[in-house]
């Protein structure tokens, strides 16, 4: 039950996280015009990964896409790549995890397969979350660097009296959405990995049992008395109890499909 809950919760958290990563990637407000300590302008600039926008006080907003690929900064390209990789991995992870969910029955899929799929999706979510966090952090670092550079020469004198105000950019809402979403995807991935451990039945190490026969003592292992006890081939595939009791061959054929139903 706890495993199903952990797996389900991990899936939901990852789903929210990936939705957030997609939202952050599409958002226009990765960087916004810094209004602090600046003259009050009737124009507000903000930029995303795909386009830059200008919102005028009049309410008119104009956005322009970055129609060049080669002319864009390498860092921006890297951030785009990280976010897209994050989304792709996350989407595949979601697809895999849907089939791995314990509450969903698909044919006669074994728990071993579900455990493997849960682990795979978990790893994908972790990498996806890390990609998003890395992408957002790279962009944030780029902003901080540019911010201090533009602060150093915020007012560039032109002809003595005339001044040009340099637009400084600060963190936009998309960065915070990206960080939170990346974190959630990462947490979801960890939860899926934890659930995988519970899904995969651990090999039971049966201790040797001593049987005292009349005349001489012989130590038998559980498989050593097939003929006399009826634990032979006739019960090989018999499900004795859903809770976890196994037949002798099921102990050996790890992992079991009857574990934690």
């Amino acid at each position: 039950m706890a495993v199903t809950a952990c797996q389900g919760l991990g899936f939901v958290v990852s789903l929210i996280g990936i939705a957030g990563i997609i939202a952050a990637t599409c958002m226009d407000q990765w960087s916004t015009q810094d209004l602090y300590n600046n003259p009050v302008t009737a124009v507000f600039n903000y930029q995303g990964l795909w386009r830059s926008c200008v919102r005028e006080s009049s309410g008119f907003t104009e956005c322009r896409g970055y129609f060049t690929l080669l002319g864009l900064p390498a860092m921006l390209q890297a951030v785009r790549a990280l976010m897209i990789v994050g989304i792709v991995l996350g989407a595949i992870g979601l697809l895999v995890s849907i089939f791995a969910l314990k509450c969903i029955r698909i044919g006669s899929m074994e728990d071993s397969a579900k455990a493997n799929m849960t682990l795979t999706s978990g790893i994908m979510f972790i990498v996806s979350g890390l990609c998003a966090i890395a992408g957002v952090s790279v962009f944030a670092n780029m902003l901080v660097t540019n911010f201090w550079m533009s602060t150093a020469n915020m007012y560039t004198g032109m002809g003595g009296m005339v001044q040009t105000v340099q637009t400084r950019y600060t963190f936009g809402a998309a960065l915070f959405v990206g960080w939170v979403a990346g974190g959630l995807t990462l947490i979801g991935g960890v939860m899926m990995c934890i659930a995988c451990r519970g899904l995969a039945p651990e090999e039971t190490n049966y201790k040797a049992v001593s049987y005292h026969a009349s005349g001489h003592s012989v130590a038998y292992k559980p498989g050593g008395f097939k003929a006399s006890t009826g634990f032979g081939s006739n019960t090989k595939n018999k499900k004795i109890y859903d809770g976890g009791a196994r037949t002798e061959d099921e102990v050996q054929s790890y992992p079991s499909k009857h574990d934690y139903v």
């Epitope: 015009q33 003259p39 009050v40 302008t41 009737a42 124009v43 600039n45 930029q47 830059s52 926008c53 200008v54 005028e56 006080s57 009049s58 309410g59 008119f60 104009e62 322009r64 032109m158 005339v162 001044q163 040009t164 105000v165 340099q166 637009t167």
Partner: antibody, heavy 118, light 113 residues
Framework: EVQLVESGGALVKPGGSLKLSCAAS????????MSWVRQTPEKRLEWVAF????????YCLDSVKGRFTISRDNAKNTLYLQMSSLRSEDTALYYC???????????WGQGNSVTVSS | DIVMTQSPSSLTVTAGEKVTMSCKSS????????????LTWYQQKPGQPPKLLIY???TRESGVPDRFTGSGSGTDFTLTISSVQAEDLSVYYC?????????FGAGTKLELK
């Protein structure tokens, strides 16, 4: 047809108060930011106050800050300018105007005269 | 506050003549985000409210004759009337639409010779 009609102008004594109104018609009032602009007897144009389309953002000329308040009622399609502690230098023809692209004032009212004199 | 300086303060012209008037701002009105200059030109005839002619320094408002042309960038702007007509005799104002307060120039009065 876009129309902006100002009202409420009068002759007031220094220190007095007045409320100007601007009735808008012919366009979706709630979609546009609005401003009050005044023209002094010397014919100089002076922007007075701005209000965003939803009314959440307002800006005022420093010399009128704390004395003038711009507001709007989108349900009534009306723009207001509440003026208090009036001074002789506030004597002007007050226009209400609509902002459009480039923050430009594309439509203006006919103007309303405010005279501050003892 | 941004100071808008218009020159000349008055211009005496003959019909059909080409006219240029200048407007200078104390700070650049160019917005780096969209590479547009937030400068507006208005025309005011006696007894009438100002009429919008040009916004974004060079974009003509619909219905404005194409003899009116706005140009310039940053801090220096020009309004050109290619062939002055009798109905163009008015006062022309430039306005900073970038920084608050939104300041106007003192105007250039166009008069007939």
């Amino acid at each position: 047809e876009v129309q902006l009609v100002e009202s409420g102008g009068a002759l007031v004594k220094p220190g007095g108060s007045l409320k100007l109104s601007c009735a808008a018609s012919g366009f979706t009032f709630s979609k546009y930011a609005m401003s009050w602009v005044r023209q002094t007897p010397e014919k100089r144009l002076e922007w007075v106050a701005f209000i965003s389309n939803g009314g959440s953002y307002t800006y005022c000329l420093d010399s009128v800050k704390g004395r003038f308040t711009i507001s709007r009622d989108n349900a009534k399609n009306t723009l207001y300018l509440q003026m208090s502690s009036l001074r002789s230098e506030d004597t002007a023809l007050y226009y209400c105007a609509r902002h459009d692209k480039g923050n430009a004032l594309d439509y203006w009212g006919q103007g309303n005269s405010v005279t501050v004199s003892s | 506050d941004i100071v808008m300086t218009q020159s000349p303060s008055s211009l005496t012209v003959t019909a059909g003549e080409k006219v240029t008037m200048s407007c200078k701002s104390s700070q650049s009105l160019l917005n780096s985000g969209n590479q547009k200059n937030y400068l507006t030109w208005y025309q005011q005839k006696p007894g009438q409210p100002p009429k919008l002619l040009i916004y974004w320094a060079s974009t003509r408002e619909s219905g404005v004759p194409d003899r009116f042309t706005g140009s310039g960038s940053g801090t220096d702007f020009t309004l050109t009337i290619s062939s002055v007509q009798a109905e163009d005799l008015s006062v022309y104002y430039c306005q900073n639409d970038y920084f608050y307060p939104l300041t106007f120039g003192a105007g250039t009065k166009l008069e007939l010779k």
